[in-house]
């Protein structure tokens, strides 16, 4: 059960309710564990993890990435800018996580868990950011057409896209986790 779900607190006797910071930290680590499992299946069934042709597929993707200007790195850290970037980035990743559904055979449930846990994480972060400026949500129409486009790719590109999404999401979450620990 993901840390964000109510049964977590009920299931553990004498467990205090998780604090907001602890919920966020545990949620990210839970998602990262899920990504590791998905990457294992991806790397086992194709040679994408060793491929040098990633640039070809990356041209079709606009995956969220942490940049210096986002204020999430130690140099140039800005907690408010960074928190907005984390939430915006996670919202942008949602379409890619939707794409990952049905991309896994033995880890289908894990892919669903990563998707659902990310939604919960976004909710936690939005609570933390309640005093910050409004966060822009991706346009549903744009997301729908992107999803269609990704699903229409040939098999090799779909495998490569899956690998790139998982790798990018892992990197994004790791950067987010480091930054959020200061907040």
């Amino acid at each position: 059960v993901p840390p964000g779900e109510d049964s977590k607190d009920v299931a553990a006797p004498h467990r205090q309710p998780l604090t907001s910071s602890e919920r966020i930290d545990k949620q990210i680590r839970y998602i990262l564990d899920g990504i590791s499992a998905l990457r294992k299946e991806t790397c086992n069934k194709s040679n994408m993890c060793e491929s040098s042709k990633e640039a070809l597929a990356e041209n079709n993707l606009n995956l969220p990435k942490m940049a210096e200007k986002d204020g999430c790195f130690q140099s140039g850290f800005n907690e408010e800018t960074c928190l907005v970037k984390i939430i915006t980035g996670l919202l942008e990743f949602e379409v890619y996580l939707e794409y990952l559904q049905n991309r896994f055979e033995s880890s289908e449930e894990q892919a669903r868990a990563v998707q659902m846990s990310t939604k919960v994480l976004i909710q936690f972060l939005q609570k933390k950011a309640k005093n910050l400026d409004a966060i822009t949500t991706p346009d549903p129409t744009t997301n729908a057409s992107l999803l269609t486009k990704l699903q229409a790719q040939n098999q090799w590109l779909q495998d490569m896209t899956t690998h790139l999404i998982l790798r990018s999401f892992k990197e994004f979450l790791q950067s987010s986790l480091r930054a959020l620990r200061q907040m």
């Epitope: 910071s21 602890e22 140099s75 907690e79 408010e80």
Partner: antibody, heavy 119, light 106 residues
Amino acid sequence: EVQLVESGGGLVQPGGSLRLSCAASGFTFSPFAMHWVRQAPGKGLEWVAKISPGGSWTYYSDTVTGRFTFSLDTSKSTAYLQMNSLRAEDTAVYYCARQLWGYYALDIWGQGTLVTVSS
Amino acid sequence: DIQLTQSPSSLSASVGDRVTITCSASISVSYMYWYQQKPGKAPKLLIYDMSNLASGVPSRFSGSGSGTDFTLTISSLQPEDFATYYCMQWSGYPYTFGQGTKVEIK
């Protein structure tokens, strides 16, 4: 040299106020969360409070909530602990500490400043 | 709040001895840290996130454990290691500390 220097401690009567300062030097202050930890004479360590690098989020122990306020002046690379309604049980050496970037560990500590609450 | 119980509260050992200090948490914790404190001085970080050695800390110090049971080991005690050791946990706020273990010269 990376260091934190606390000041502002002293003798104060119960119910009184005191403001502690923690001046940072030798590192860029802006990305780090800061903490206060105290140690009563001959006793163990007790965490008091944390402030995020830009001051947007503060966290306090139950024993000081509503009485202590943590603030920052990033232009001076200084953290402050405003202590009101002081009690005898607040008597302790107060340490400020820096939180290690990307972790929850407290990696750099000041030498401490003694606060004595007594009539 | 999460309670941390260290054992022993104090111990006597000789230079070269292998020393083990344990820290038991009242419930499972997310992160565990170990600090060394000498009289009149500030605490010094030794171990973070259960087992990572802090910068500048000699490799004779090591940390292990998970869940509720954690251990600090000094593989070969040196004269400068006589001090009080504290475990500290973070699983949300507040951070809490163990009561300390004083390592004295036998």
